[in-house]
Amino acid sequence: YDFTNCDFEKIKAAYLSTISKDLITYMSGTKSTEFNNTVSCSNRPHCLTEIQSLTFNPTAGCASLAKEMFAMKTKAALAIWCPGYSETQINATQAMKKRRKRKVTTNKCLEQVSQLQGLWRRFNRPLLKQQ
């Protein structure tokens, strides 16, 4: 999916008002310095591509983020403010129902959500030069 035509300001507002708080809740009890940010993004569409990938694609050691509250809200924001995104999710939603897993918070998941926090922060500062 190409995130170029999303309503970035509305997605940003949703992040600031609610998604960011859910990410913080998920990470509660973890020091902010505990994980190094290894995933980066260069512009808003790229950031959303990386955010989608880390949030919804199961990875080794962390297969359970998609049912978290921040993930549900991310999915809603993309479906509402990214033209045509909801259509791409119709088959994906049906597939996810089949492979739904028990929610487990592993260290790998905490690391992944830490990366997500960094990607979202970058998404909110699109004019900053890449470090």
Epitope: A14, S17, I80, I90
Partner: antibody, heavy 120, light 107 residues
Framework: QVQLVQSGPEVKKPGSSVKVSCKAS????????MHWVRQRPGQDLEWMGT????????DYNQNFKGRATITADKSTSTAYMELSSLRSEDTAVYYC?????????????WGQGTLVTVSS | EIVLTQSPGTLSLSPGERATLSCRAS??????VHWYQQKPGEAPRLLIY???QSISGIPDRFSGSGSGTDFTLTISRLESEDFAVYYC?????????FGRGTKVEIK
């Protein structure tokens, strides 16, 4: 089963406001956005805007920006649409319709409609 | 704003005949089109979503096809209860828009 029950008909004077309610039951309120669509007599359907309980935010058709306010009370699973500065051309049936925001993504259930008549 | 143009405006057919309704979008909207049926004094009822996805409880004589800008709703054999107005709607982007409707009437 899923039900959207709207408030009763209203007769309003030009320049006044109207607030229509839509009480939802039979599903998890925050899993769906609530859209508002109006239909003027003998006319087609016109999307007014939506409230997304999961994100606690609303979005509007620019044609109604500033005149329409869409809100919801999550504790009672009730959505509201307020339209101000009413004029005769706002005489219409106003519908609420739910739309999944993390699945289905379509207006699959509608309220029965609320007739708002604007007349001096 | 995406404009949806429905044709024909009115379709006069007899029960048992096949109805083919068209909806054309002013720009590419992939498959983000949904079809509704509306009878006088009633709210619209969802028939088909995302161009061709069927809805449980909707008779299988209703089917949809198309992508990009051209979409079709087909009623394979008209029943008496099918005479109504049919609307297409796009959810590709805000503001969501509806076509002006096709009235299917008894010939």
């Amino acid at each position: 089963q899923v039900q959207l029950v709207q408030s009763g008909p209203e007769v309003k004077k030009p320049g006044s406001s109207v607030k229509v309610s839509c009480k939802a039951s039979g599903y998890i309120f925050t899993d769906y956005a609530m859209h508002w669509v109006r239909q003027r007599p003998g006319q087609d359907l016109e999307w007014m805007g939506t409230f997304i309980p999961l994100l606690d935010t609303s979005d509007y058709n620019q044609n109604f920006k500033g005149r329409a306010t869409i809100t919801a009370d999550k504790s009672t699973s009730t959505a509201y649409m307020e339209l101000s500065s009413l004029r005769s051309e706002d005489t219409a049936v106003y519908y609420c319709a739910r739309m999944g925001v993390t699945h289905s993504y379509v207006m699959d259930a509608w309220g029965q409609g609320t007739l708002v008549t604007v007349s001096s | 704003e995406i404009v949806l143009t429905q044709s024909p405006g009115t379709l006069s057919l007899s029960p048992g005949e096949r109805a083919t309704l068209s909806c054309r979008a002013s720009q590419h909207i992939s498959r983000s089109v949904h079809w509704y049926q509306q009878k006088p004094g009633e709210a619209p009822r969802l028939l088909i979503y995302f161009a061709s996805q069927s809805i449980s409880g909707i008779p299988d004589r209703f089917s949809g096809s198309g992508s990009g800008t051209d979409f079709t709703l087909t009623i394979s054999r008209l029943e008496s209860e099918d005479f109504a107005v049919y609307y297409c709607q796009q959810s590709y982007s805000f503001p969501y828009t509806f076509g002006r409707g096709t009235k299917v009437e008894i010939k």
